[in-house]
Amino acid sequence: VNLKSSNRTPVVQEFESVELSCIITDSQTSDPRIEWKKIQDEQTTYVFFDNKIQGDLAGRAEILGKTSLKIWNVTRRDSALYRCEVVARNDRKEIDEIVIELTVQVKPVTPVCRVPKAVPVGKMATLHCQESEGHPRPHYSWYRNDVPLPTDSRANPRFRNSSFHLNSETGTLVFTAVHKDDSGQYYCIASNDAGSARCEEQEMEVYDLN
């Protein structure tokens, strides 16, 4: 028996359906035994065994065309390696298997944003943005008065009166010394391949000490 797959690394968004492709290309056995294993953090569970869908796929998966596995309403917990194993006792090569790595992408939820309400001129200020659910891990962008901020204020002449650095991986926006022009309405957007989400606008006021 020999197997192939039309896609060994399928990527799907949460709550969609996906087909894990496992195709017998040649076999002399009319009724080969099909098994599907799910491997997550080295742990194994069978999701198709003894001709039954089982485990956490029970009720939301089926076998298509003898060997492929279709999963509906995919959840983030379905992200795993799946082994399609076929045993054909009458064949010269009795066993074949293929590994399929399923990635389930999850849209970001509304990020938690922390913006200082009031900062004195010349002082440092840090704005935080964090999102906990997105997969792959989201990238963050900050906006002031609906204008996107670059990762470094020095890279854009429009922001020459500002002095900040944005880490798009951690969501942290750091002003080394705030200017009056840095006052405004701030919000953050967390985005990945599955979608994006933004937090509510929050005002940061920059005030003179005198």
Partner: antibody
């Protein structure tokens, strides 16, 4: 922490059989494949097969079909391998190892086949 | 069955050297390759899994790379305790198979 404790060394006669064991601790025994591997000096490492203790399913390297029999006892979290019709070619160190990605190994059992 | 050809089979290097061991598979193994270290009289210890992921507790001087049929284990700065035999192992499909081993001495 994960531990795989294997039984002691065996000196056995040609034609006889031997059963070696691998007691697992520090993890859920029924949730991980258990692999068995043979190591002979000069011959490197050979994969014998695996058993999934959760349902007793096994898979063998065709080379060891009829030579090795893998079993698992859930109540004692112990995997066993029986080797039959022993010859000098079966003299080796045998390891059990855990998981699809074969992460943790037992310390090995030396089996010597000699008359 | 997938054959794993490992080279060199023997390697002598000095402390601080950068050391590279390679494994070539007879067909694409889709990065399902581990590297193990085995010291005399001990069980193999997993260093790298799935081509390039470092096993917890293993020093960062060990790294892995590769894809398709060609894979590499690199020790960036050899230490005296790295004297051992190193094996690659494919778990992509069929009977799992090992490379022939590389005996590393200082």
């Amino acid at each position: 922490q994960v531990q795989l404790q294997q039984s002691g060394a065996e000196l056995v006669k040609p034609g006889s059989s031997v059963k070696i064991s691998c007691k697992a601790s520090g993890y859920t025994f029924t949730s991980y494949d258990m692999h068995w591997i043979k190591q002979q000096p000069g011959n490197g490492l050979e994969w014998i097969g695996w058993i999934y203790p959760g349902n007793g399913n096994t898979r063998y390297n065709q080379k060891f079909n009829g030579k090795a029999t893998l079993t698992a006892d859930k109540s004692s979290s112990t995997a066993h391998m029986q080797l039959g019709s022993l010859t000098s070619e079966d003299s080796a160190v045998y390891f059990c190892a855990r998981g699809d990605g074969v992460d943790y190994w037992g310390q090995g059992v030396m089996v010597t086949v000699s008359s | 069955d997938i054959q794993m050809t490992q080279s060199p089979s023997f390697l002598s290097a000095s402390v601080g050297d950068r050391v590279t061991i390679t494994c070539k598979a007879s067909q694409n193994i889709n990065k399902y390759l581990n590297w193990y270290q085995q010291k005399l009289g001990e069980a193999p210890k997993r260093l790298i899994y799935k081509t390039n992921s470092l096993q917890t507790g293993i020093p960062s001087r060990f790294s892995g790379s590769g894809s398709g049929t060609d894979y590499t284990l690199t020790i960036s700065s050899l230490q005296p305790e790295d004297v051992a035999t190193y094996f690659c192992f494919q778990y992509n499909s069929g009977p799992r198979t090992f490379g022939g081993g590389t005996k590393l001495e200082i």
